[in-house]
């Protein structure tokens, strides 16, 4: 029988008025030895499921069930996964701002629409919060002395077109 709580290991508790290391009772844990009480284990239920079960030395860890994601430190809340057109922020699901989109369900961030003009293309279809813009074919910019060779399908022969 010891006379101090100082040497108690994690997974135990100890009372100053009766300084003996006692094992934590069922469904409790103590990550630091020598404390006057063990802590009640977290229970993962409802929208939560166990990521890690409770032991006498560590609390349980929870994660959210399919279709939900964690919010807050140590996954204190579960929120429905974000829809396409939204992204997950610290405040929860937020709609993508104008000029950005997210086409993924539950994950991903809002990304800027493709800038078609950087590729020398026109916008064929405007973007939405859920979909990127659709760029058209390259815009042909004609300059003098450009020769375009046109070869009809199925024939070796070609026509030469001189653009002045």
């Amino acid at each position: 029988v010891q006379n101090s709580c100082d040497n108690c290991q994690p997974g135990t508790f100890c009372r100053k008025y009766n300084p003996v290391c006692k094992s934590c009772p069922p469904s409790t844990f103590s990550s630091i030895g020598g404390q006057p009480n063990c802590n009640i284990c977290r229970v993962c239920a409802g929208y939560f499921r166990f990521k890690k079960f409770c032991s006498s030395t560590h609390n349980a860890e929870c994660e959210c069930i399919e279709g939900f994601h964690c919010l807050g430190p140590q996954c204190t809340r579960c929120e429905k996964d974000c829809r396409p057109g939204q992204e997950l922020t610290k405040q929860g699901c937020k709609t993508c701002s104008l000029g950005t989109f997210n086409d993924q369900n539950g994950t991903g961030v809002c990304r800027p629409w493709t800038n078609c003009s950087l590729d020398g293309r026109s916008v064929l279809k405007t973007g939405t919060t859920e979909k990127d813009v659709v760029c058209g074919p390259p815009v042909v910019s004609f300059s003098p002395s450009t020769t375009i060779s046109v070869t009809p399908e199925g024939g070796p022969g070609g026509h030469s077109l001189q653009v002045l």
């Epitope: 100053k16 008025y17 934590c24 009772p25 006057p36 009640i40």
Partner: antibody, heavy 124, light 106 residues
Framework: EMQLVESGGGLVQPGRSMKLSCAGS????????VAWVRQAPKKGLEWVAY????????YYRESVKGRFTISRDNAKSTLYLQMDSLRSEDTATYYC?????????????????WGPGTMVTVSS | DIQMTQSPSLLSASVGDRVTLNCRTS??????LAWYQQQLGEAPKLLIY???SLQAGIPSRFSGSGSGTDFTLTISSLQPEDVATYFC????????FGAGTNLELK
């Protein structure tokens, strides 16, 4: 020396009130869940009321609900039992005792440290 | 509420005897059972918790056994200072004490 000392007992008329105190010394009473357990003359033991270590949770046995109030002042390391509308069947020695279970729990208590008790007599 | 039955209610024994006290609960309490000793004019003292764990400072002649609904407190060699009333208490569902066993010397 570590001890619990109850005070405030005595003779009281039925229907009247009385407040018991329990002072802890030599250790930190605020670390523990604490209960009042009573014992009628020449009878068995009966748990009366419980308060969690921080004071946020209280439990009462059915026969005292609405009449007794358990509270604590952690700064003064003191526990209280306010007893109103007293009845003759409340006559007993009242013990202040610490919950030894060790789980910050409101459901499993055994009592591993007791005060000497204070006698409460309800009689006209 | 869980009912507690202690037997016998009165027990006479001699110094040096092996003494057995019984406690039965009306439903399964697993190992959530404690034993207390109360000497005349004194507060109760915890002897055993979790059915068989000896409280620090209690002589090793005291031992507890049992699980479920039937429990036993054994004093391996009775000493004069063991004369007292012994109570069992379940703490599985609420808290209930037995009526006690009064242990006296023959």
């Amino acid at each position: 020396e570590m001890q619990l000392v109850e005070s405030g007992g005595g003779l009281v008329q039925p229907g009247r009130s009385m407040k018991l105190s329990c002072a802890g010394s030599g250790f930190t009473l605020s670390d523990y869940g604490v209960a009042w357990v009573r014992q009628a003359p020449k009878k068995g033991l009966e748990w009366v009321a419980y308060i969690s270590y921080a004071g946020g949770t209280t439990y009462y046995r059915e026969s005292v609900k609405g009449r007794f109030t358990i509270s604590r002042d952690n700064a003064k390391s003191t526990l209280y039992l306010q007893m109103d509308s007293l009845r003759s069947e409340d006559t007993a020695t009242y013990y202040c005792t610490i919950d030894g279970y060790g789980g910050y729990s409101g459901s499993h208590w055994y009592f591993d440290f007791w005060g000497p008790g204070t006698m409460v007599t309800v009689s006209s | 509420d869980i009912q507690m039955t202690q037997s016998p209610s009165l027990l006479s024994a001699s110094v040096g005897d092996r003494v057995t006290l019984n406690c039965r609960t009306s439903q399964n309490v697993y190992k959530n059972l404690a034993w207390y000793q109360q000497q005349l004019g004194e507060a109760p003292k915890l002897l055993i918790y979790n059915a068989n764990s000896l409280q620090a400072g209690i002589p090793s002649r005291f031992s507890g056994s049992g699980s479920g609904t039937d429990f036993t407190l054994t004093i391996s060699s009775l000493q004069p200072e063991d004369v007292a009333t012994y109570f069992c208490q379940q703490y599985y569902s609420g808290n209930t004490f037995g009526a006690g066993t009064n242990l006296e010397l023959k």
